[in-house]
Amino acid sequence: QPCPYPMAPPNGHLSPVQAKYILKDSFSIFCEPGYELLQGHLPLKSFAAVCQKDGSWDQPMPSCSIVDCGPPDDLPSGRVEYITGPEVTTYKAVIQYSCEETFYTMKVNDGKYVCEADGFWTSSKGERSPPVCEPVCGLSARTTGGRIYGGQKAKPGDFPWQVLILGGSTAAGALLYDNWVLTAAHAIYEQKHDASSLDIRLGALKRLSPHYTQAWAEAVFIHEGYTHDAGFDNDIALIKLNNKVVINSNITPICLPRKEAESFMRTDDIGTASGWGLTQRGLLARNLMYVDIPIVDHQKCTAAYEKPPYSGGSVTANMLCAGLESGGKDSCRGDAGGALVFLDNETQRWFVGGIVSWGSMNCGEAGQYGVYTKVINYIPWIKNIISNF
């Protein structure tokens, strides 16, 4: 006996169309673009029913339901706006992602996504994953291009990348992105296998103030070329934080140097170092201090550290020097790991050119200079660690 004549569901069509369907005859259902085969909530890629000997179809008719891409993924540090209509998530609906203004910028695409027939929110470039809100780097409240031994007091927002690292001795670091800290290898070497012991503080101005944002380390990455207690070559390290920090006017990452950055770091160009290290009084600073110091000719610096008690070859090509020939302005113990920053005149953003590493026994000594890890030499290393971990 023939099976009941099948009626295609709305927004679907049936094939093949026959005058009647008898034993072993079958039909398939195909949905219009933007509609999908469903049995209730369960999706089907294809549907075919077979006429059985008792005159019934072996399965019920599915529906062709409009594709629903569902609520779009949340965007950390951003928001999503429904363009087509409130909460509309069906085929051809449009949404617009945007990042929190001032402190975040959108990476990857323009943030416009459409609900496509395959059920995925898709950007104009064909990406299915949501965009990324990346922290804006190098913003500072400072208006001048002005260190710590012989320095001045910093004001809120002047050095929002400044990180205070406790857990061993007092050290410093600089925030990169929203979950990495750039610092000196020697400053955290003792904690390299005990990352969780590092007490990391952001957004602080006063060293002992309770007003700061607490962060904890997930992992420590010491440059493989660094040898502890055998000079300071490759004195660079990264700390991965176990959570992303919220970016604001007091907590903002420093930029990494662009390829063209060396044009802003020539001899006599001014860099700024900041920290809570020893001041002229011989005590750790209570308030975050900063000092503006010029870059020193590399040969001049090398020569300054070839005399005893320093050994020849102390200053390598992976280092840069800064300070006054007359002395009086320098970074000092407790500043280690902090950033020596420069203003990129083209982007008007601050970038890290050096990391406070080592210097003369007596900070601010005439004819001696502060020695900093030359960050531009380590951009591939930094990017490799950050992208892989």
């Epitope: 049995q39 909530h41 369960l42 999706p43």
Partner: antibody, heavy 115, light 107 residues
């Protein structure tokens, strides 16, 4: 014949992430249907966790959505479950299954959440 | 969420009896209901889908009916091997939900 087999650790510590994999043989997970995870606490009934469809789209139980991720590896014909921040209440037998026109279940794997 | 309420929660019947288990949905689920049988320590086995369609290999004594909110699983002549817990399940909407189960024993 279609076969599903769950694998993963039988013991997970509280607050950690439970990770299970379902290996499918005899049918490609991209060919059709929804590939589900279902669990059954000791002595209790069945609870649907979510599915990943043939196209890679996911649907999750709203009561677990904030903690659940279902993904797939089409090259290995596998789909996986990750359940974060587990507690003792997540102790159960976990099944992978394809439901509706095809109906096949894995044998189930017992996961205990305990320190 | 759609609640699926089964009754009775347990029942005892004799071999050869006609057994009926009912399932009530808290809202309309069309015919998107399946029935499962689970024997102690075993994996659930599907019996019925789309309220009344029997899976291949399932004995003809099992049948299902209903639509909307009221559904029934019938065993026309109870056999000793039918001792199990039976679950209804709706797959009409997210989340898929199961009834609490009906435990069937032989008198």
């Amino acid at each position: 014949e279609v076969q599903l087999q769950e694998s993963g650790p039988g013991l997970v510590k509280p607050s950690q992430t439970l990770s299970l994999t379902c290996t499918v043989s005899g049918y490609s997970i991209t060919s059709d249907y929804a590939w589900n995870w279902i669990r059954q606490p000791p002595g209790k009934g069945l609870e649907w966790i979510g599915y990943i469809s043939y196209s890679g789209r996911t649907s999750y139980n709203p009561s677990l959505k904030s903690r659940v991720t279902i993904s797939r590896d089409t090259s290995k014909n596998q789909f996986s479950l990750k359940l974060s921040s587990v507690t003792a209440a997540d102790t159960a037998v976990y099944y992978c299954a394809v439901l509706y026109a095809l109906d096949y279940w894995g044998q189930g794997t017992t996961v205990t959440v305990s320190s | 969420d759609i609640q699926m309420t089964q009754s009775p929660s347990s029942l005892s019947a004799s071999v050869g009896d006609r057994v009926t288990i009912t399932c009530k949905a808290s809202q309309n689920v069309d015919t998107n209901v399946a029935w499962y049988q689970q024997k102690p320590g075993k994996v659930p086995k599907a019996l019925i889908y789309s309220a009344s369609y029997r899976y291949s290999g399932v004995p003809s004594r099992f049948s299902g009916s209903g639509s909307g909110t009221d559904f029934t699983l019938t065993i026309s002549s109870l056999q000793p091997e039918d001792v199990a817990t039976y679950y209804c399940q709706q797959y009409n909407s997210n989340p898929l939900t199961f009834g609490q189960g009906t435990k069937l024993e032989i008198k």
